[in-house]
Every structure is written in structure tokens, then in C-alpha cells.
């Protein structure tokens, strides 16, 4: 389970509010850190182990997911054709 935590908020300027957000995720046994719907998430460790990145549903709703060559990451293709590439080190 993950929750978004607001680390600090700068409201010194009335017309502008700046917030730094981070995810706090507590993974269950058999899960490790991953990405689901473009957000930090706990995912099945076997997905990471086998590098079947698209199985963790990393792209936003409506986007298409494809594995990069050698399973080095994935691409998310928007309906308009724009492609976002994520590589895993």
C-alpha cells in the first residue's frame, strides 16, 4: 500500500503554493518497489525478477505498454502517439 505524503508546503506567497510530495509504501511479503499507473507501488517481486515490466501496469490508463529490447525497461505510448521511455538500471 502506498500513500502520498506532503513533505513541506510553501505558502509564503499567497498566489503560489509549492508542495513537495513523496510516496510512502509499505510492501507485503513477496512484493518489492515498482510502478503502477505511473506512480510508486508495491508489485509482485517475480515481475521484477523476470523483467516483465508491463505486468505491473506502469503506464497511465489508456496508454499502451511495450517492453524495450532485452527487457531493459518499457515504453508507454499515449493515444496521440507520444512515447515515454523508462529504462531500469
Amino acid at each position: 500500500t502506498c500513500e502520498i505524503v506532503t513533505l513541506d508546503r510553501d505558502s509564503s506567497q499567497p498566489r503560489r503554493t509549492i508542495a513537495r510530495q513523496t510516496a510512502r509504501c509499505a510492501c507485503r511479503k513477496g512484493q518489492i518497489a515498482g510502478t503502477t499507473r505511473a506512480r510508486p507501488a508495491c508489485v509482485d517481486a517475480r515481475i521484477i525478477k523476470t523483467k516483465q515490466w508491463c505486468d505491473m501496469l506502469p503506464c497511465l490508463e489508456g496508454e499502451g505498454c511495450d517492453l524495450l529490447i532485452n527487457r531493459s525497461g518499457w515504453t508507454c505510448t499515449q493515444p496521440g502517439g507520444r512515447i515515454k521511455t523508462t529504462t531500469v538500471s
Epitope: A23, R24, A26, C27, G30, I32, A33, A45, K49
Partner: antibody
């Protein structure tokens, strides 16, 4: 990666012991940690584990209710407290590391099948 | 409980396979030369090999059974090999009773 256990020795039945594992050579706060023991004539037995950030703990059935595992990420140590000692607690106690490096913002359990490093062990004898 | 054979034997240079089944998540293999002595991980996370372990050691997962293979076994490989994983419910760690490898 180095794991160094201490605190073993001769203990009396009904007493308590505190084992400490000092880690070095890796980012301690990113890894789940384990205590595993080997009792005479037996194989390896899962004793306890703790998540990388210390928020989660789990215990083997033989020590549940008598054991407490804790960690100090600042000092890179993991401790096992075992109360109400019994003769069957006699054995060699090993500290072990789970290989997965949990990223910041995540709390992760280790996995027994992902143990990639062990301490040398510390011997505990429970006898009157 | 995990199931692994109590003993296996082989001549130097032969290939040895030791199986372990009955767990969940990932499997590891741990070598011990004598009771109470140091444990050495030869395989972790199903098929990963620590950098200081010879390439003759390999692991493979098929279903819920993991197989440790030692290709071209050597006299120095004589030891007890324990497998480790999580119990079938995934609530605690569990180890096999150990397989004694004898090199003839």
C-alpha cells in the same frame, strides 16, 4: 559485505539473551535482515526477521512470544532479544541479509530465498 | 516443510542436481562444510550467483521446485546444501533439512 554477531555464550534456563549483529560494507537501511539458528542435530531454523526500516517484524513459531528483533539503522545493527530461555534454544545463531535493496520511501520485507550474505554465527548454550 | 534429498554422491567431474520443493516466492541454496560452521550462499533469488561463487553452481526454478546444479563437481564441493524459501503461506521463512553431497 560483513555481518558480525556477538552476545552468545553460556546462558541459564529461564534467563534472557541479547544478540547483536553489526553490519558493514553496504547500505544497511535498504535491506531486510534475518536471524537464523542451527540447533544440535537439526538443520537451519528461521528465528526472526525485520523490514529494512524496522516497521515490520516476524518470528518463527519456536520463539514467538519470547523473541524481539529490532534494528538501529544509524548504527547498522540488528538485535535479537530472546527471553525465557530453554535448553532447545541451544545452537549457533546467524545473522543474514536479504539481497534486495529497497529504495527510499519504501518499506520492504526480506525473503529467505534472497539471503546473499551470512555472519559467522555466535554460539549459544542454555544449561544450568 | 521443504522437500530435498538427504544425500547425493558423485565422482569428480560429474554433474549433480539437488531439488527443493514445497515453498513459495524465491529459493536460495546455502552451503555448510560442517555443522555450526559458516554458511555460504551459492545461489539466491532462484538463479542468482554471488560474484565469488564458481560458475559451476547454477539454480533454476520450474513451478514451485528449484534445482541446484553443480556442473563438474569438485572435492571442495563436498558439504551439506540447505535450500531456503518462504513457507507455502508466505508467512515465515523455512529451510530444507539439508542434502549431504559426497564426492567419491
Amino acid at each position: 559485505v560483513t555481518l558480525d554477531e556477538s552476545g552468545g555464550g553460556l546462558q541459564t534456563p529461564g534467563g534472557a539473551l541479547s544478540l547483536v549483529c553489526k553490519a558493514s560494507g553496504f547500505t544497511f537501511s535498504s535491506h531486510g535482515m534475518f536471524w537464523v539458528r542451527q540447533t544440535p542435530g537439526k538443520g537451519l531454523e528461521y528465528v526472526a526477521e525485520i523490514t529494512n526500516d524496522g516497521s515490520g517484524t516476524n518470528y518463527g513459531s519456536a520463539v514467538k512470544g519470547r523473541a524481539t528483533i529490532s534494528r538501529d539503522n544509524g548504527q547498522s545493527t540488528v538485535r535479537l532479544q530472546l527471553n525465557n530461555l530453554r535448553a532447545e534454544d541451544t545452537g549457533t545463531y546467524f545473522c543474514a541479509r536479504s539481497t534486495y535493496e529497497c529504495p527510499g520511501g519504501f518499506s520492504c520485507w526480506g525473503d529467505t530465498g534472497q539471503i546473499d550474505a551470512w555472519g559467522h554465527g555466535t554460539e549459544v548454550i542454555v544449561s544450568s | 516443510a521443504l522437500t530435498q534429498p538427504s544425500s547425493v554422491s558423485a565422482n569428480p567431474g560429474e554433474t549433480v542436481k539437488i531439488t527443493c520443493s514445497g515453498g513459495s516466492y524465491s529459493y536460495g541454496w546455502f552451503q555448510q562444510k560442517s555443522p555450526g560452521s559458516a554458511l555460504v550462499t551459492v545461489i539466491y533469488w532462484d538463479d542468482e550467483r554471488p560474484s565469488d561463487i564458481p560458475s559451476r553452481f547454477s539454480g533454476a526454478l520450474s513451478g514451485s521446485t528449484n534445482t541446484l546444479t553443480i556442473t563438474g563437481v569438485q572435492a571442495d564441493d563436498e558439504a551439506v546444501y540447505f535450500c531456503g524459501t518462504e513457507d507455502i503461506s508466505g508467512t515465515a521463512g523455512v529451510f530444507g533439512a539439508g542434502t549431504t553431497l559426497t564426492v567419491l
